[in-house]
Amino acid sequence: IVLRPSRVHNSEENTMRALTLKDILNGTFSYKTFFPNWISGQEYLHQSADNNIVLYNIETGQSYTILSNRTMKSVNASNYGLSPDRQFVYLESDYSKLWRYSYTATYYIYDLSNGEFVRGNELPRPIQYLCWSPVGSKLAYVYQNNIYLKQRPGDPPFQITFNGRENKIFNGIPDWVYEEEMLATKYALWWSPNGKFLAYAEFNDTDIPVIAYSYYGDEQYPRTINIPYPKAGAKNPVVRIFIIDTTYPAYVGPQEVPVPAMIASSDYYFSWLTWVTDERVCLQWLKRVQNVSVLSICDFREDWQTWDCPKTQEHIEESRTGWAGGFFVSTPVFSYDAISYYKIFSDKDGYKHIHYIKDTVENAIQITSGKWEAINIFRVTQDSLFYSSNEFEEYPGRRNIYRISIGSYPPSKKCVTCHLRKERCQYYTASFSDYAKYYALVCYGPGIPISTLHDGRTDQEIKILEENKELENALKNIQLPKEEIKKLEVDEITLWYKMILPPQFDRSKKYPLLIQVYGGPCSQSVRSVFAVNWISYLASKEGMVIALVDGRGTAFQGDKLLYAVYRKLGVYEVEDQITAVRKFIEMGFIDEKRIAIWGWSYGGYVSSLALASGTGLFKCGIAVAPVSSWEYYASVYTERFMGLPTKDDNLEHYKNSTVMARAEYFRNVDYLLIHGTADDNVHFQNSAQIAKALVNAQVDFQAMWYSDQNHGLSGLSTNHLYTHMTHFLKQCFSLSD
């Protein structure tokens, strides 16, 4: 007997329908957010529905079009950027994606004063990165791995670097591993606040081993994609930071910023650069063994034309229980004295909190405290500090915005968002104008997302920027699943979970259970956000219960939980998913013969290990683009959590934690393995090795590859993927089509 949600017969419910897979694949119920493109304390730009670029002045209430959709269309522009002096706009077209953040594009400069495109000394194409100076209308751009500077848009460029070479030397842009695992940006250059200096990173990948894979395309012979990609333990990129005076760059030339001695003594990373003033810059460095980070404040010495980084301005952050920071080492937010700063790091109780550093880290003043975590510092003004945390009502999966008055003593704290739309909004981010005169709040859920504009002084709501009315109306006749966020207490570990229940859920009935897992270090899956996605459909239409569980290794609940997985990836994450499943079975409404698990990327690794745990709990499962051995993944990410794959370090656990080592245990489960052949991130090699191990063990399994698709499996592949996975699960759970 297959148990399905019972159909309700009252007339109102009759008009309601369940979600369909088509709804999900078509993005029928996607939502919009509104992030103002701030250009001053009280003005912002926004691209209207008809593609005009409109300038809004909050104080006058006026708005006018600064760039018409006709101009945008004339060069097929998909993006724009206004120069700070408001004389020019760059228009971006021919977008061509490279990796997660990087892309190339063609850029045109439009002169707003005469309503014409700038002719003469046009920009080359395609450009890898382009940006205006923070003041005026200087342009810095990266072309063919070299940095160029234009004093004015119509001027000829000045070439700053000359050694750029594809896959060898990267100037002003990161190489693959820095882009994905360290900077999380497409750029590696930073203007000083008034545009006097330009800092940039040079990445030398000459000695890095190359990952090569076939790109099949349409030609007779496939192309080979080559990417310098350091896997765990391999040679890493060599990074150097330079700063050049942008007024007369041809005189002194680029000046290298010295690396702190304690960092330079062995392999290291550059992690971020923060300008403090035009003549003070803050660099963050990290040892290759990522438990020591150094923040170095450097000053420009006019008489020497050098950047001086005194030892007295070096601040060390060290973790004795795990790695430095959360996912990344946090960045400082400097106060108005241009030397003291606010930064999030672990307090003595092992919770990440805001600290104020005036002279040394040892003498840091703790600004926030409690058994919760400060997550992001948005803005520091003369009298206020705005940050987000998950303090409110002790739900780690929420985000509220707080203001601390730093101008008064003792500082007072106010939650700006906690009671605004309490049921609808429990997960916020914010975007501030200059001097935090105004700010936008973007609420992601759990209700339908809404974006609002607020006065930075009074916190008063000024207007709704986007409330997703159309979405709200469209959902009125949809039977959405119910969602609940709760916690399990198991052996002194708190396991937060989100359960997605069929619309007519009945506790007395039995339902198939699907675990959706990610579980990577410093991740969080159990969040109070709105989503209508594939698992919503599975609950709404197919009557499944879906659960997401945040186990050990996940974020924002203190270091004990976060660092539990240090040097032991693949153990506790899996254990905690299994523990949660057992608890769910005890709740009485789960059909224990129909339990599945699925995950993507790190989640694919965890789901594979869970299926191969030998517990007999899972009937089937899916791994999409899984890591299968930590020796195959990127050095920066892997070594942060696992150390080095060497005999005298952690090679043993690298070997013990592979999926291949458990090939035999897949014999009693139905396993669907999926991977894109052009995955630049988690290489197809990972799934190839799983498949080989399963074949060698003579274990039957199902597999699907997506030719020429990367880690995201986008476009038509997405439709095929979710259709294929749906069939697999329905078959596993004996649900009829």
């Epitope: 000829p156 005189y251 002194v252 030339g253 020497w304």
Partner: antibody, heavy 117, light 108 residues
Framework: EVQLLESGGGLVQPGGSLRLSCAAS????????MSWVRQAPGKGLEWVSA????????YYADSVKGRFTISRDNSKNTLYLQMNSLRAEDTAVYYC??????????WGQGTLVTVSS | EIVLTQSPGTLSLSPGERATLSCRAS???????LAWYQQKPGQAPRLLIY???IRATGIPDRFSGSGSGTDFTLTISRLEPEDFAVYYC?????????FGQGTKVEIK
């Protein structure tokens, strides 16, 4: 006071080699890019080569590429130009100058290199 | 490479007169990268103007520079006896840096 003092010039046969030196004082030598500029007898100025402050990057005019090598020793505050496979057209007064590509704000007095058989 | 053409080749003037020297580039040069030098016989060149119009340290204010794009000018408002020399313009906007062929300012 900034001072640049070239040395090492002289008479050399075609195909021969010569090493020019430029001793710098009066400024933080390691901070500045430096250049060599030459002037053939009765002719104009021609940029020859440049080197970054750290010595990590070097630049050459096409006319000398592959034959001349610019280097520096920051501990000795000295700039060098190693000239190999010299030709008659390399005959010139060689100046060392403070600066990368422009401006050259200080110049040495120059050293004469004569390439002749 | 960018070719700089200076005119006139020679300028014959008397002390106290105004001298106007021209420098034309074969392609556009951003003014930040244009310099002027003075060279006297048997001496090294001396920087006069950088950034097309900014006087170097110790240069008298009778020397001024102007221009943009492809046309640049060095003006000596009132020639002093010590100003009779060869003047070179130079660009560093593009590698290789190049010099004009020089303008000789001689006593009439």
């Amino acid at each position: 006071e900034v001072q640049l003092l070239e040395s090492g010039g002289g008479l050399v046969q075609p195909g021969g080699s010569l090493r020019l030196s430029c001793a710098a004082s009066g400024f933080t030598f390691s901070s500045y890019a430096m250049s060599w500029v030459r002037q053939a007898p009765g002719k104009g100025l021609e940029w020859v080569s440049a080197i970054s402050g750290s010595g990590g990057s070097t630049y050459y005019a096409d006319s000398v590429k592959g034959r001349f090598t610019i280097s520096r020793d920051n501990s000795k505050n000295t700039l060098y130009l190693q000239m190999n496979s010299l030709r008659a057209e390399d005959t010139a007064v060689y100046y060392c100058a403070k600066g990368w590509f422009t401006p050259f704000d200080y110049w040495g007095q120059g050293t004469l290199v004569t390439v002749s058989s | 490479e960018i070719v700089l053409t200076q005119s006139p080749g020679t300028l014959s003037l008397s002390p106290g007169e105004r001298a106007t020297l021209s420098c034309r580039a074969s392609q556009s040069v951003s003014s930040n990268y244009l310099a002027w030098y003075q060279q006297k016989p048997g001496q090294a060149p001396r920087l006069l103007i950088y950034g097309a119009s900014i006087r170097a340290t110790g240069i008298p204010d009778r020397f001024s520079g102007s221009g943009s794009g492809t046309d640049f000018t060095l003006t000596i408002s009132r020639l002093e006896p010590e100003d009779f020399a060869v003047y070179y313009c130079q660009q560093g906007n593009q590698i290789p840096p190049t010099f004009g062929q020089g303008t000789k300012v001689e006593i009439k």
